[in-house]
Amino acid sequence: QEGKFSGPLKPMTFSIYEGQEPSQIIFQFKANPPAVTFELTGETDNIFVIEREGLLYYNRALDRETRSTHNLQVAALDANGIIVEGPVPITIKVKDINDNRPTFLQSKYEGSVRQNSRPGKPFLYVNATDLDDPATPNGQLYYQIVIQLPMINNVMYFQINNKTGAISLTREGSQELNPAKNPSYNLVISVKDMGGQSENSFSDTTSVDIIVTENIWKAPKPVEMVENSTDPHPIKITQVRWNDPGAQYSLVDKEKLPRFPFSIDQEGDIYVTQPLDREEKDAYVFYAVAKDEYGKPLSYPLEIHVKVKDINDNPPTCPSPVTVFEVQENERLGNSIGTLTAHDRDEENTANSFLNYRIVEQTPKLPMDGLFLIQTYAGMLQLAKQSLKKQDTPQYNLTIEVSDKDFKTLCFVQINVIDINDQIPIFEKSDYGNLTLAEDTNIGSTILTIQATDADEPFTGSSKILYHIIKGDSEGRLGVDTDPHTNTGYVIIKKPLDFETAAVSNIVFKAENPEPLVFGVKYNASSFAKFTLIVTDVNEAPQFSQHVFQAKVSEDVAIGTKVGNVTAKDPEGLDISYSLRGDTRGWLKIDHVTGEIFSVAPLDREAGSPYRVQVVATEVGGSSLSSVSEFHLILMDVNDNPPRLAKDYTGLFFCHPLSAPGSLIFEATDDDQHLFRGPHFTFSLGSGSLQNDWEVSKINGTHARLSTRHTEFEEREYVVLIRINDGGRPPLEGIVSLPVTFCSCVEGSCFRPAGHQTGIPTVGM
């Protein structure tokens, strides 16, 4: 019967476990005339056989490590051996069993680490290989530190990345390792297959000797630099040093200042390049960075602190050209008239900005000089000798000297003598009645005019009226502006009215003077008035609880996962229907009742994160009013992008014949996120057959060197396949091709006869 084990000739794939003795046929192909026999070609390895009648079988156990996929072709032949059907591809996938143990590439590793190295930054890799399939647990390796010697206070100073074998310092190791105390450590590292999760896993161990070296990459002490220096610039102020020669130093201005007055040379000496002004900026914090020849940071940046020391280069300044104070006729001796507050831009709470006040002149000197005194340090003016009479002298002018330790400034004060404040403001009416307004009345609208009068001296603080709402507007929706000429009060809307929270408000106004009332006089009912504000309902759009809603999910969440939700309420209490707008990638859907947002397609951080869409809340029924808010979906990275070449490497060439083995450097990248330490790719040749001619060696986490192993290359193009592994979770591998041309050279460039100008290599090695 046709089915699982027999049928017509068509492309097929079969999976067979390695290591198992053959127990049954793979498939029986059925011939359609004129086909009478079958023929098997491809990677049979003398294991796979097809009988003339179409019976496909294998005759001995398979080994995945020899060949993981057998690409076979089956053709149906007629009686003359001519192909009449096919050939069709038959793929045999050899399934892995755990029949290989992991093996460290070295029985002993040696490495060194600087004290205070960044925790988690690898300084050494141990590497084991397991011939089993890395896509299955059989070939998934798990590294562990078995023992650390010496172990001080039971604290581990070293850690290993279970997946990559990268050895780095722990937080404690970064803080406590000290070559003066313990210059060397030994680690025993184990590697297990089966991801370390099975009792049946195979394992291997290796020994790692680690030397601790001193770290001189340390932040210098904070620097103090006097402002307005007249010395020739640049001036060296401090220095940093990387542990090894050849580092490239640079400064990073985190504050993005328009003028950054510091520089660093290639010795690590830091300079100030121009005089500083403390009053412009009193302190600088910037970073010194050391990078390798490829521009990769060698370690964490060092924070450089520069404090700018003050000199007394600023005189005191007056608060205004003339400062005006008022004093009532009957005020008592010692009463405060007002405080003159002068400023000094020099550093606060230092002698450079400490001010003294002194009255140097009073005009007129009637009825006598010295009517006023000023507190030397506080600047408060007081009545010194007697009460003043308005009809004698309505105005006094004082000249006041304000001084710091080096500079003197004159400030001018005008003191107006005013009538006593013995009259209270009186409202023209105590009840302004009812006022009905729609809740959507514009902010800034004047809704009512109120008026009180005061019989004291006009245009003084005794007769000026200030209106306050003392009751009925706890939300501060209303305010009162006063016309200084007429003392008319204009009641205005400062915040939106709201029928739903305050349909009726009983408002009480109080009218008062800025000057204090004379002793014995008090505000009474005449200084109070009321009115009733009635707010009518307007159908309003729904209101979202936030302007922007934010959610965070991993980019590999399953389709249908809830990724966030939004909430809105309708002021009138109507139901709300939610919808999405601007979902340009078609990733999301929203539950129109609950506001819950779900994924409906695979998400991709690399396409852009955060993903921004608009959410719309619409009233159900009523006027169908709607409002809009933002939903921002932050996508967290998963390792879903294999490494690739960072740029186009067409045009690499060596001059033929090679006089000595040559090399070239290439860079890898991938689109995943690499926080803190950047990518850590490992590089190997893409196929075993390349190993006689080529060698690839890692330079750092992103760069590798491709070298020739000999000089006997033909004059042609070679395509070198490179396998790049990102060591992520899960590890992803990319196979990239570097085309390298060996060509005759003229003056160091590839020679091409005329008419062969296409694709001229441009990079000579």
Epitope: P33, P34, V36, T37, D78, A79, G81, I82
Partner: antibody
Framework: QVQLQQSDAELVKPGASVKISCKAS????????IHWVKQRPEQGLEWIGY????????QNNEKFKGKATLTADKSSSTAYMQLNSLTSEDSAVYFC?????????????WGQGTTLTVSS | EIVLTQSPALMAASPGEKVTITCTVS???????LHWYQQKSGTSPKPWIY???NLASGVPVRFSGSGSGTSYSLTISSMEAEDAATYYC?????????FGSGTKLKMK
């Protein structure tokens, strides 16, 4: 010993038909394909077609479609070729040949040839 | 159809001379599908070399065959009188099967 015995020479008039036979002995008739090849005087060899007796399946060179009809009688282990609407162009020696039944495939045994003369 | 071109069409060789006949195929074929037949006057063709280089039963070892793709040859290392005959190449790659036009080899 494998032998392919062909019928004797034929002299026929233009427009007529003729049926040439090829009797196989010394091997299983149905296991092999029988091919027919034409050779005009002082000329090369031309493949006409073949028959696979087990199915009675035939395949002709497009050039001989409508001219040659191939049949076989399994009981007598004989293959036949009938040629229709004869003209002087059909005057030639016709060979039957047997193909091997497995790789390598080639004509391993040939009949002695049948001479056909078309003349009025 | 696949066309086979033989050269030379006619040649004469002295005893002991080395002889090479070539067969050019109009499109590339597998070497296992190129055969040579010998025909003497008044007799049926005989299989001579099959699969480019394998000698059929009873063929003297002075005969050899070689080639690949579109270019094939039959070689006699030392001509003898009995080798005088017409030699045909033939392709077994696709229908219709075709023969070369033949090379007539004579003794000088």
């Amino acid at each position: 010993q494998v032998q392919l015995q062909q019928s004797d020479a034929e002299l026929v008039k233009p427009g007529a038909s003729v049926k040439i036979s090829c009797k196989a002995s010394g091997s299983t008739f149905t296991d092999h394909t029988i091919h027919w090849v034409k050779q005009r005087p002082e000329q090369g060899l031309e493949w006409i077609g073949y028959i696979y007796p087990v199915y009675g399946y035939t395949q002709n060179n497009e050039k001989f479609k409508g001219k040659a009809t191939l049949t076989a009688d399994k009981s007598s282990s004989t293959a036949y070729m009938q040629l229709n609407s004869l003209t002087s162009e059909d005057s030639a020696v016709y060979f039957c040949a047997r193909s091997r039944d497995s790789n390598p495939y080639y004509f391993d045994y040939w009949g002695q040839g049948t001479t056909l003369t078309v003349s009025s | 159809e696949i066309v086979l071109t033989q050269s030379p069409a006619l040649m004469a060789a002295s005893p002991g001379e080395k002889v090479t006949i070539t067969c050019t195929v109009s499109s590339s074929i597998s070497s296992s599908n190129l055969h040579w037949y010998q025909q003497k006057s008044g007799t049926s063709p005989k299989p001579w070399i099959y699969g480019t280089s394998n000698l059929a039963s009873g063929v003297p070892v002075r005969f050899s065959g070689s080639g690949s793709g579109t270019s094939y040859s039959l070689t006699i290392s030392s001509m003898e009188a009995e080798d005088a005959a017409t030699y045909y190449c033939q392709q077994w790659s696709s229908y219709p099967f075709t023969f070369g036009s033949g090379t007539k080899l004579k003794m000088k």
